[in-house]
Interface confidence: medium
């Protein structure tokens, strides 16, 4: 139904709360180089604003677009020209262009800082002085870092940042308290971040058909008893929630997440019987809880695949008649009794058999034709499955850190033209996808690794776009989104690659790596793999092998001597002569 | 917000030593880190040292370690950076800055809030 004022009608249902904070995340992911105190100004402002429309619905500009109200304040900041450049050229523009040309400013890869974390004392006194603020800072940090962050589930991690808090300040060792429950809400947030950036990415490069054909495939494995019209519903719905927060409307996003959590609460019967544990929870864990609740149990009399896709008269018919229909039925039926597979290879056999159907059906005997289709998903679902086999083998022969190299020589070999960090950057977290998955039952490993690995890979291609160096890496990340992971694996070794010259301030370390913590140590140490890598493409796995053993052996020594300066000084050059000579 | 003060400045022989102050109002200092920068003409922000919020980390920059000293006071907000063995190319505008949080932080963007700067000139 329509309302009078939009404004006043969000901070009714969402809160006060949830609305400073919803609207905070969205001028920190439109503006993210504004300091806190600038934006917590402009959201006191909003809110004040949306609490005089609340009072009367038809009092100036109550009635005006989210869109429009949100852009004139942010459009009204001092300076925004000498510090976000042509986006101030956005502020020209009238609505709906004027924040499409927001969206399109939003930097994927922003020049801060990283966001460190306080002292355990620091953080518990600046927590207890004032909650709201220090609450605001943390999504403030991450929204700006961070421009695609699904907003719900941001204020869920803010949540749960604070039941931490509020827990481990109490505590007498509030250090050992924190820091594994952050790292943990951390490592959950960073992953939550990619996937949902990948979403956005479907829907703005191949629109909402793509999305919704994603939800399908992913609602119809967790919610198998559930019918194609109840699956159809939900997709519609979730793509729109989606697109909103895709779009920057995250006020609007938040409060249609919860209606669909209501929804889904008060039909648990038709949709699953797996839902009550999270229905009982309050709104941001209930809706977190349902979007990653656990697969129901399938119906066990589901009938072979092939009587109404292949053997079914009909086929061609039924497909002319209604081609999405059909094949939404196909990939629902397909992907409810594939729980063990990746949404991304359900949707490349979706795609196989679009492509055979539409070759087929134009022949003089289809069935002759697409008889065979079935067969022909073999090797799509072999490759996947061998990758994951190789790959947890490697995963739990070398452990993280060793199977994180190795994924650095195979990626650096593939496009050795890409910036060094961004190679490190790419290998640590196609890396963590042996702890991630390797370690979890042998029917959920292929969904967890090819799903994770598609979203590290999507970042891979967002961040090239910015600067293409890679003609494989355009080649890649060219195509449609369920063919990237495929087509990176196939790489191989860029024989157009012309070496880097070995310099020998690249191998050059002091003293004050020692002092690093074991994080940054490791990024040492791979961005000094990645440089032997561009220096000589083909060396074998046993010379780079031998030279980061000996490299190891160096910062051990040095590390541990007395006078580090002048092992490092000494030692230093010896390494470098000596890896030449490893890699001659 | 923070209001940052430097004071101290001033000219220095070769050798010699020197002690800036930073006074902080406003908002609560407590949880903040603060940083001692400096600049000089056409050359980018350095940072020189700074202090977390209670006073248990001090940090350095490599070009002042073992010379500059942080330290600080919270009861009466104030951080002081004692410079000996002061050369002519210690010569710069002295910042000193704050950082929300408690990190060791050592880039400038990691700041929110900074004085106006102290002239400090190292003659030979």
């Known amino acids: 139904e329509a309302h009078k004022s939009e404004i006043a009608h969000r901070y009714n249902d969402l809160g006060e709360q949830h609305f400073k904070g919803l609207v905070l995340i969205a001028f920190s992911q439109y503006l993210q180089k504004c300091s806190y105190d600038e934006h917590a100004k402009l959201v006191q402002e909003v809110t004040d604003f949306a609490k005089t429309c609340v009072a009367d619905e038809s009092a100036a500009n109550c009635d005006k677009s989210l869109h429009t109200l949100f852009g004139d304040k942010l459009c009204a900041i001092p300076n925004l020209r000498e510090n976000y450049g042509e986006l101030a050229d956005c502020c020209t523009k009238q609505e709906p262009e004027r924040n499409e040309c927001f969206l399109q400013h939003k930097d994927d890869n922003p020049s801060l800082p990283p966001f460190e974390r306080p002292e355990a004392e620091a953080m518990c006194t600046s927590f207890k002085e004032n909650p709201t603020t220090f609450m605001g800072h943390y999504l403030h940090e991450v929204a700006r870092r961070h421009p695609y962050f699904y907003a719900p589930e941001l204020l869920y991690y803010a949540e749960q940042y604070n039941e931490i808090l509020t827990q481990c300040c109490a505590e007498a060792d509030k250090e050992s308290c924190l820091t594994p429950k952050l790292d943990g809400v951390k490592e959950k947030a960073l992953v939550s971040s990619v996937r949902q950036r990948m979403k956005c990415s479907s829907m703005q490069k191949f629109g909402e058909r793509a999305f919704k054909a994603w939800a399908v495939a992913r609602l119809s494995q967790t919610f198998p008893n559930a019918d194609f019209a109840e699956i159809t519903k939900l997709a519609t719905d979730l793509t729109k929630v989606n697109k909103e927060c895709c779009h920057g409307d995250l006020l609007e996003c938040a409060d249609d997440r919860a209606e669909l959590a209501k929804y889904m609460c008060e039909n648990q019967a038709t949709i699953s019987s797996k839902l009550q544990t999270c229905c009982d929870k309050p709104l941001l864990k209930k809706a977190h809880c349902l979007s990653e609740v656990e697969h129901d149990t399938m119906p066990a009399d589901l009938p072979a695949i092939a009587a109404d896709f292949v053997e079914d008269q009909e086929v061609c018919k039924n497909y002319a008649e209604a081609k999405d229909v059909f094949l939404g039925t196909f990939l629902y039926e397909y992907s409810r009794r594939h729980p063990d597979y990746s949404v991304s290879l359900l949707l490349r056999l979706a795609k196989k058999y679009e492509a055979t159907l539409e070759k087929c059906c134009a022949e003089a005997n289809p069935p002759a034709c697409y008889g065979t289709v079935l067969a022909e998903f073999q090797p799509l679902v072999e490759e996947p499955k061998n990758l994951v086999k190789t790959n947890c083998d490697l995963y739990e022969k070398l452990g993280e850190y060793g199977f994180q190299n190795a994924i650095l020589v195979r990626y650096t070999q593939k496009a050795p033209q890409v910036s060094t960090p961004t190679l490190v950057e790419a290998a640590r977290n196609l890396g963590r996808v042996g702890t991630k998955c390797c370690t979890l039952p042998e029917d959920q490993r292929l969904p967890c690794v090819e799903d994770y690995l598609s979203a590290i890979l999507n970042r891979v291609c967002l961040l090239h776009e910015k600067t293409p160096v890679s003609e494989h890496v355009t080649k890649c990340c060219s195509g449609s989104l369920v063919e990237r992971r495929p087509c990176f694996s196939a790489l191989t070794v860029d024989e157009t690659y012309v070496p880097k010259e070995f310099k020998a301030e690249t191998f050059t370390f002091h003293s004050d790596i020692c002092t690093l913590p074991e994080k940054e140590k490791q990024i040492k140490k791979q961005t000094a793999l990645a440089e032997l890598v561009k220096h000589k493409p083909k060396a074998t796995a046993e010379q780079l092998k031998t030279v980061m053993d000996d490299f190891a052996q160096f910062l051990d020594t040095c590390c541990k001597a007395a006078d580090k300066d002048t092992c490092f000084s000494t030692e230093g050059p010896n390494l470098v002569t000596r890896c030449k000579d490893a890699l001659a | 917000e923070v209001q940052l003060v430097e004071s101290g400045g001033g000219l220095v022989q070769a050798g010699g030593s020197l002690s800036l102050s930073c006074a902080a109002s406003?908002?609560?200092?407590?949880?903040?880190?603060m940083g001692w920068f400096r600049q000089a003409p056409g050359k980018e922000r350095e940072f020189l040292a700074g202090?977390?919020?209670?006073?248990?980390?001090?940090f350095y920059g490599d070009s002042v370690k073992g010379r500059f000293t942080a330290s600080r006071d919270s009861a009466k907000n104030t951080v002081t950076l004692e410079m000996n063995s002061l050369n002519p190319e210690d010569t710069a505008v002295y910042y000193c800055a704050a950082a929300y949080g408690g990190g060791l932080y050592r880039d400038p963007r990691s700041y929110d809030y900074w004085g106006r700067g102290t002239q400090v000139t190292v003659s030979s």
């Open positions: 406003g908002r609560t200092f407590s949880p903040y880190t």
């Open positions: 202090v977390t919020w209670s006073g248990s980390s001090t």
